[in-house]
Amino acid sequence: QNASRGRRQRRMHPNVSQGCQGGCATCSDYNGCLSCKPRLFFALERIGMKQIGVCLSSCPSGYYGTRYPDINKCTKCKADCDTCFNKNFCTKCKSGFYLHLGKCLDNCPEGLEANNHTMECVSIVHCEVSEWNPWSPCTKKGKTCGFKRGTETRVREIIQHPSAKGNLCPPTNETRKCTVQRKKCQKGERGKKGRERKRKKPNKGESKEAIPDSKSLESSKEIPEQRENKQQQKKRKVQDKQKSVSVSTVH
């Protein structure tokens, strides 16, 4: 990365340029490079108790470069900073620190969260969902005919996925019970499939979170002649069972 490193090897007096190595324009016995060839950056490297001048093609990690008219100079960033724009503004922190508004922090401030890829503090993003789409047609085993109980589904899209500390997304699918319109199925009629994929029917004891309490929803949908007494309902249940056997064989 910083290939043009120049330090002198032979003994010589300060400011004598003959014999300077690499990118040095002038150098000294004790301090190494004193100035650099054009376009190279001058940096001071600490070796033990002394500082040695070196000439580099770009400033090393932890330093930033200033192009003065007479010298390109590398200046140290703050201790916790890996890359900086200047002394005040860090642009990449050292490992274990998070960048926030040009500063390196151990932890992100309240209301922000750490992004462990960029190592920056970012705003917490909460889930956002669209409005519900219209309910799908009422179907039973994919059919929209034959007077029986079915289900209808509606969906909504996730507009904004949440970040790690953001609020989780609410359900994006909702299913409720409904009554298939009172209409005889034509022979071999397959029925109009609903727009929704068939949802797997929850087993007993399985969570029905996405299925709201449908009693109140159903009652508002029923028309008077659809109301049945308990005896009729029992009778229908037996008929439904027989029908569903024959229906299930239709492919």
Epitope: Y68, N86, F89
Partner: antibody, heavy 116, light 107 residues
């Protein structure tokens, strides 16, 4: 809190001299290159000169070279601009600023009017 | 010296508008660009450094982008306090140079 307070501005005749001062506080003055930036009435910003953190090197815009001298006293946290042979085109608000690639801290400015 | 050309030189807009100011460098300056805001009778205030990084305390409606020679400052939804003059400055090398400024006025 960072503060830069300029003083020394005023009305002066062409060819005369003026010395501006800038008192700094709230940051490590000796760590920063310091500059003067000026703004003529109704015009844009124009960099005038910069002195590096230890006072060893100074840089000037061409139009002020040989007339203006920039110096600093790190023991007093103060920046100076000695302006000689003033011209009408030097009329401006002069801002003192901490210069580290960008101008991070600014004073409130002092007005210099060169008029006969 | 590197020349910085800002456009437009003035701009009328309303509260809530999205506004974009551009700055063009006469040579490649990488991302070494700074934006300042100046209100009448006040000193300039640093808004954005390294072309796109927001200074502490600057509202997130301000954003900067660009690299090389073309840069933009965007205010996503103008607020009454944003009516001011904006300057770009290249920090790539000496001598530091500014754009001529963009005065943002209320329509």
């Amino acid at each position: 809190e960072v503060q830069l307070v300029e003083s020394g501005g005023g009305v002066v005749q062409p060819g005369r001299s003026l010395r501006l001062s800038c008192a700094a506080s709230g940051f490590t003055f000796s760590d920063y290159d310091m500059a003067w930036v000026r703004q003529a009435p109704g015009k844009g910003l124009e960099w005038v000169a910069t002195i590096i953190y230890d006072g060893s090197r100074t840089y000037y815009r061409d139009s002020v070279k040989g007339r203006f001298t920039l110096s600093r006293d790190n023991s007093k946290n103060t920046l100076y601009l000695q302006m000689n042979s003033l011209r009408a085109e030097d009329t401006a608000v002069y801002y003192c600023a901490a210069h580290d690639r960008s101008f991070d801290y600014w004073g409130q400015g002092t007005m210099v009017t060169v008029s006969s | 010296d590197i020349q910085m050309t800002q456009s437009p030189s003035s701009l009328s807009a309303s509260v809530g508008d999205r506004v974009t100011i551009t700055c063009l460098a006469s040579e490649d300056i990488s991302n070494d660009l700074v934006w300042y805001q100046q209100k009448p009778g006040k000193a300039p205030k640093l808004l954005i450094y390294a072309a796109s990084r927001l200074q502490d305390g600057v509202p997130s409606r301000f954003s900067g982008s660009g690299s090389g020679t073309d840069f933009t400052l965007t205010i996503s939804s103008l607020q009454p306090e944003d009516f001011a003059t904006y300057f770009c400055q290249q920090s790539y090398k000496y001598l530091p140079t500014f754009g001529q400024g963009t005065k943002l006025e209320i329509k």
